[in-house]
């Protein structure tokens, strides 16, 4: 297993609709054809997997049908979008990249993106 540098923004504020997008960029040392991207969430010392996708270079990322993540790839960059976020989902989202094929296997883990999510203010009660 060889180490690889992964860069991602430090802080991002999700949209009022609970959507956060960020780029995860990896310094590929070779010509990988198969890449796996995993998003991990760290909060209160717990790390949980948010979503994961394996893709062939030049193809779309395919997450599971019920995944809250979508993404596109371009060269050594992966543009990740996480949807359906609420204030309780605020936390550190870490991008993990694995170059699966061809060998050697490379692993890179970013420093994480602190995603802040603001629940929208409830609408004031209407008289109508």
């Amino acid at each position: 297993c060889k180490a690889m540098h992964v860069a991602q923004p430090a802080v991002v504020l999700a949209s009022s609709r609970g959507i956060a997008s960020f780029v995860c960029e990896y310094a590929s040392p070779g010509k990988a054809t198969e890449v796996r991207v995993t998003v991990l969430r760290q909060a209160d010392s717990q790390v949980t997997e948010v979503c994961a996708a394996t893709y062939m270079m030049g193809n779309e990322l395919t997450f599971l049908d019920d995944s809250i993540c979508t993404g596109t790839s371009s060269g050594n960059q992966v543009n990740l979008t996480i949807q359906g976020l609420r204030a309780m989902d605020t936390g550190l989202y870490i991008c993990k990249v694995e170059l699966m094929y061809p060998p050697p296997y490379y692993l890179g883990i970013g420093n994480g993106t602190q995603i802040y999510v603001i629940d929208p203010e409830p609408c004031p009660d209407s008289d109508f």
Epitope: V11, L13, A14, S15, F22, Q42, D44, A87, Q114
Partner: antibody, heavy 116, light 108 residues
Framework: QVQLVQSGAEVKKPGASVKVSCKTS????????ITWVRQAPGQGLEWMGW????????NYAQKLQGRVTMTTDTSTSTAYMELRSLRSDDTAVYYC?????????WGQGTLVTVSS | EIVLTQSPGTLSLSPGERATLSCRAS???????LAWYQQKPGQAPRLLIY???SRATGIPDRFSGSGSGTDFTLTISRLEPEDFAVYYC?????????FGPGTKVDIK
């Protein structure tokens, strides 16, 4: 080294607007946020809101909602805070700070005086 | 919104003494997203501690932070003349990001 340099002191009349700038250097501007904090004379720190320089999304303190607008110019790594309909109790030193979650670097402050 | 309460309001001590400042949150601060700042008259605040216990760059080791959940403490092991200032705690785990009212450490 990281630096945040704010625009100079302003004197405004009640009802007017003020726009304070915060020019940053020494770090990747779009990877972080910029927050604005104010301090009335002899008082504590009041958080006004922040902007994510990565995507331009904003989050304002409820009491200032509708009167404050925070923006960024990524081409010059500069953040702006505009406060409208100024009142005498808006007289304060206004600080910008870099958001890494916590506020790790601060501007020198801009005194805004609201007086008729 | 998370309300932070600091105590005491003023702490009168002599150089060389130990200072213990308290910050209590109205609800749990997630992932210990609590910071401490020092402010001297006419100056901008300066970050001392983040993540409840991590010292910011360039901060001397006489400053230490501890605590989790709703109770946090800033300790200055031996007060130096330059440490007499106002100290604020702040939570950045949930919006709105809130500050405590501050504790003034002055010379006895």
């Amino acid at each position: 080294q990281v630096q945040l340099v704010q625009s100079g002191a302003e004197v405004k009349k009640p009802g007017a607007s003020v726009k304070v700038s915060c020019k940053t250097s020494g770090y990747t501007f779009t990877s972080y946020g910029i927050t604005w904090v104010r301090q009335a004379p002899g008082q504590g720190l009041e958080w006004m809101g922040w902007i994510s320089a990565y995507n331009g999304n904003t989050n304002y303190a409820q009491k200032l909602q509708g009167r404050v607008t925070m923006t960024t110019d990524t081409s010059t790594s500069t953040a702006y805070m505009e406060l409208r309909s100024l009142r005498s109790d808006d007289t304060a030193v206004y600080y910008c700070a870099k958001v890494s979650g916590y506020f790790d670097y601060w501007g020198q402050g801009t005194l805004v005086t609201v007086s008729s | 919104e998370i309300v932070l309460t600091q105590s005491p309001g003023t702490l009168s001590l002599s150089p060389g003494e130990r200072a213990t400042l308290s910050c209590r949150a109205s609800q749990s601060v997630s992932s210990s997203y609590l910071a401490w700042y020092q402010q001297k008259p006419g100056q901008a605040p300066r970050l001392l501690i983040y993540g409840a216990s991590s010292r910011a760059t360039g901060i001397p080791d006489r400053f230490s932070g501890s605590g989790s959940g709703t109770d946090f403490t800033l300790t200055i092991s031996r007060l130096e003349p330059e440490d007499f200032a106002v100290y604020y705690c702040q939570q950045y785990g949930r919006s709105p990001f809130t500050f405590g009212p501050g504790t003034k450490v002055d010379i006895k």
